[in-house]
């Protein structure tokens, strides 16, 4: 088993509203949980985009998930990832 | 302060419906996940259905899915619980949460509202 | 879902006395996603204690929270009057959320 490195990005979307992307990358096996939290909560999933688990080339895999969160609310939003029964959470950069 | 005050709750026959209402002040309530939680008389707590802030992400516990719903109306501070097809086992005092920011947790509690289910 | 389940059920305890009340999920969860409440006779209950650890408003220090994975625990150390209630533990690492059944707290 290899964990996977998490990372997450922020980025402008539209007035008042950021995009936020959480990363996980050099990851084995390919089952994980990538999910965004507003206060500890899993969002619907209509309101996440993922992106498919693909092979990075190193024999382990990658993938991320986004949402679009208010701007000023960043500290309610984590990353929640789970992968081999480890799980972890990743705040929204400042 | 803080203030969450539930009413609707009164007898209703099994196979009835019944709304009930929390209404919430002291707080902006458009920025706060609620939640219903109930507990039947002499048992403990039971979870029942979350709502987030802006109302696009909702859970039900197994027992009401289906069958109830909530919502919220944020103008005007209030949380929701519409119940159908009731049962006996719905009985209970149904309580309105407020959901803590960040952490979680059910951080602040009104009074209750009894709901009886009975012929 | 997530089973949580609490013991002992009911604890009797002289004042001045240590209590440790534990909360055991039936998979593991996130410390950050359980709390604890707890509730007297003929009130609404209360938050206590938060992600696993941290004191709720106005808790006296006297309460404690620890653990990680599946086993989660509540201690008083030098058990008081007003303690005597019942305490519910409460995950949301999973939708549905759900409660444990409680430990009833009383007074020898």
């Known amino acids: 088993t290899v964990p996977p490195m998490v990372n997450v990005t922020r980025s402008e979307a539209s007035e008042g509203n950021i995009t936020v992307t959480c990363r996980a990358s050099g990851f084995y096996p390919w089952n994980i949980t990538l999910s965004w939290r507003q206060d500890g909560v899993s969002l619907s999933h209509d309101t996440q985009q993922w992106g498919d688990v693909l092979p990075d080339g190193n024999g382990t895999y990658q993938t991320w998930v986004a949402t679009r969160i208010c701007q000023g609310e960043e500290q309610r939003f984590t990353c929640y990832m789970e992968h081999s029964g480890n799980h972890s959470t990743h705040p929204v950069p400042s | 302060d803080v203030h969450l005050v539930e009413s609707g709750g009164g007898l209703v026959q099994p196979g009835g419906s019944r709304k009930l209402s929390c209404a919430a002040s002291g707080f902006t309530f458009n920025t706060f996940g609620m939640n219903w939680v109930r507990q039947a008389p002499e048992k403990g707590l039971e979870w029942v259905a979350y709502i987030n802030s802006g109302s696009n992400t909702i859970y039900y516990a197994d027992t009401v899915k289906g069958r109830f719903t909530i919502s919220r109306d944020n103008p005007k501070n209030t949380l929701f619980l519409q119940m159908t097809s009731l049962r006996s086992e719905d009985t209970a005092m149904y309580y309105c949460t407020r959901w803590e920011p960040v952490t979680g947790g059910f951080s602040y509690w009104g009074q209750g509202t009894l709901v009886t289910v009975s012929a | 879902q997530i089973v949580l389940t609490q013991s002992p059920a009911f604890k009797s305890s002289s004042l001045g006395e240590r209590v440790t009340m534990t909360c055991t999920a039936s998979?593991?969860?996130?410390?950050?996603?359980l709390h604890w409440y707890q509730q007297k006779p003929g009130s609404s209950p209360k938050l206590w204690i938060y992600?696993?650890?941290n004191l709720a408003s106005g808790v006296p220090a006297r309460f404690s929270g620890s653990g990680s994975g599946t086993s989660y625990s509540l201690t008083i150390s030098t058990m008081e009057a007003e303690d005597a209630a019942t305490y519910y533990c409460?995950?949301?690492?999973?939708?549905?959320?759900?409660f444990g059944s409680g430990t009833k707290v009383e007074i020898k």
């Open positions: 409460h995950q949301h690492h999973r939708s549905p959320f759900t």
């Open positions: 998979s593991s969860i996130s410390s950050s996603y």
């Open positions: 992600t696993t650890s």
